[in-house]
């Protein structure tokens, strides 16, 4: 079935993350967050692994997350890293592998039995403890779409868009994620200007809606940079 | 055993849109790489775009940046590939299929284990 053949190990030759194989002709040498790159050769190994530049857990793949490859590193280089496995430390939900969530810093199994308790237990303590955080990162008070077995509704929370039902997304909201609306027409929407900047807001807005892309507003062009209003807009 | 199915797909003048959609089955969709490929006839099959897990990160073949749109809902087991500005040379059997999305990289065509049976786009001059 689909989920024992993405939960199992059976890819064992997995060509280079974005950024394509060295060597290997018409791959693309460099990636940009946002942006799939095609490259790499069907027989390399994930030995092989190039580091993918990410702003968000969201743009790594399922079994990886997003952050700044050294410790105590400059936030706004970070690379998609290998997931944690069981009993390793972590600083919040997406650094655990599919499976597993982050409980007072180490991995521990998702048993879907006390999840939900856990979570709940998990965001009162962060905001019951003056918004504290492990060694300097937000608890990602969140929980693997895997987990789910109804979509979140508006206000629910979440680890990524797919655990929200439709016409919502997984956004920031404090110090946790939780199902937001999708931006309709003409709603404010959040453009970032620079790589890692999604960090810096604690209340996120959601993605435009289909067919909708986030640009400047037409009479906002004479503004200054810093207060240029962006709003979502027909392609 | 997971099954897509495309759907949208049909005749229409160059300058104009169609809205292709690609349903799954199986639960675990969230967590795969959804891609379009394209094949014309005496032609080999071809990535067109594709969209990770979440929505985040897509590619788009250079022959159809600007004109078309993937995008997926999570929640209705759906890929979408909206085609604006279709050329005749855009004519061809398209087809979703879906892959792992363990590592943040774009899947060689090998990679994608499910494929659909393909819808037919005729783009007439």
């Known amino acids: 079935t689909l989920n024992s053949v993405l939960n199992s190990n059976a890819i064992k030759n997995l060509p280079p993350p974005l950024g394509g194989a060295a060597g290997h002709p018409g791959s693309a040498v460099s990636a940009a967050p946002g942006i799939l790159y095609p490259g790499g050769n069907k027989y390399q190994t994930i030995d092989n692994y190039q580091p993918y530049p990410c702003a968000e857990d969201e743009e790594c793949g399922t079994d990886e997350y997003c952050a700044s490859p050294t410790r105590g590193g400059d936030a706004g280089v970070q690379i998609c890293l290998a997931c944690r496995k069981r009993r390793k430390r972590c600083m919040r939900h997406a650094m655990c592998c599919p499976g597993n969530y982050c409980k007072n810093g180490i991995c521990v199994s998702s048993d879907q039995n006390h999840f939900r308790g856990e979570i709940e237990e998990t965001i009162t303590e962060s905001f019951g403890n003056d918004h504290s955080t492990l060694d300097g990162y937000s608890r990602r008070t969140t929980l693997s779409s895997k987990m789910y077995h109804t979509k979140g509704q508006e206000g629910s929370v979440c680890l990524r868009s797919s655990d929200c039902a439709s016409g919502l997304c997984c956004a920031r909201h404090f110090w946790s994620k939780i199902c937001k609306p999708v931006l309709k027409e003409g709603q404010v929407c959040t453009k970032h200007r620079r790589k890692g900047s999604h960090g810096l807001e604690i209340f996120q807005r959601c993605y435009c809606g289909e067919g909708l892309s986030c640009r400047i507003q037409k009479d906002h062009h004479q503004a200054s940079n810093s207060s240029r209003l962006h709003t979502c807009q027909r392609h | 055993e997971v099954q897509l199915v495309e759907s949208g797909g049909g005749l229409v003048q160059a300058g104009g849109s169609l809205r292709l959609s690609c349903t799954a089955s199986g639960s675990a969709f969230s967590s795969t790489v959804v891609g379009w490929f394209r094949q014309a006839p005496g032609k080999e099959r071809e990535l067109v775009t594709a969209i990770n897990w979440s929505g985040a990160r897509t590619y788009y073949a250079d022959s159809v940046k600007g004109r078309f749109t993937i995008s997926r809902d999570n929640a209705r087991n759906t890929a979408y590939l909206q085609m604006n500005s279709l050329k005749p040379e855009d004519t061809a059997v398209y087809y979703c299929?879906?892959?792992?999305?363990?590592?943040?990289?774009?899947?060689?065509?090998?990679?994608?284990?499910?494929w659909g049976q393909g819808t037919q786009v005729t783009v007439s001059s």
């Open positions: 299929a879906a892959g792992s999305d363990r590592y943040a990289r774009v899947l060689t065509e090998y990679e994608y284990m499910w």
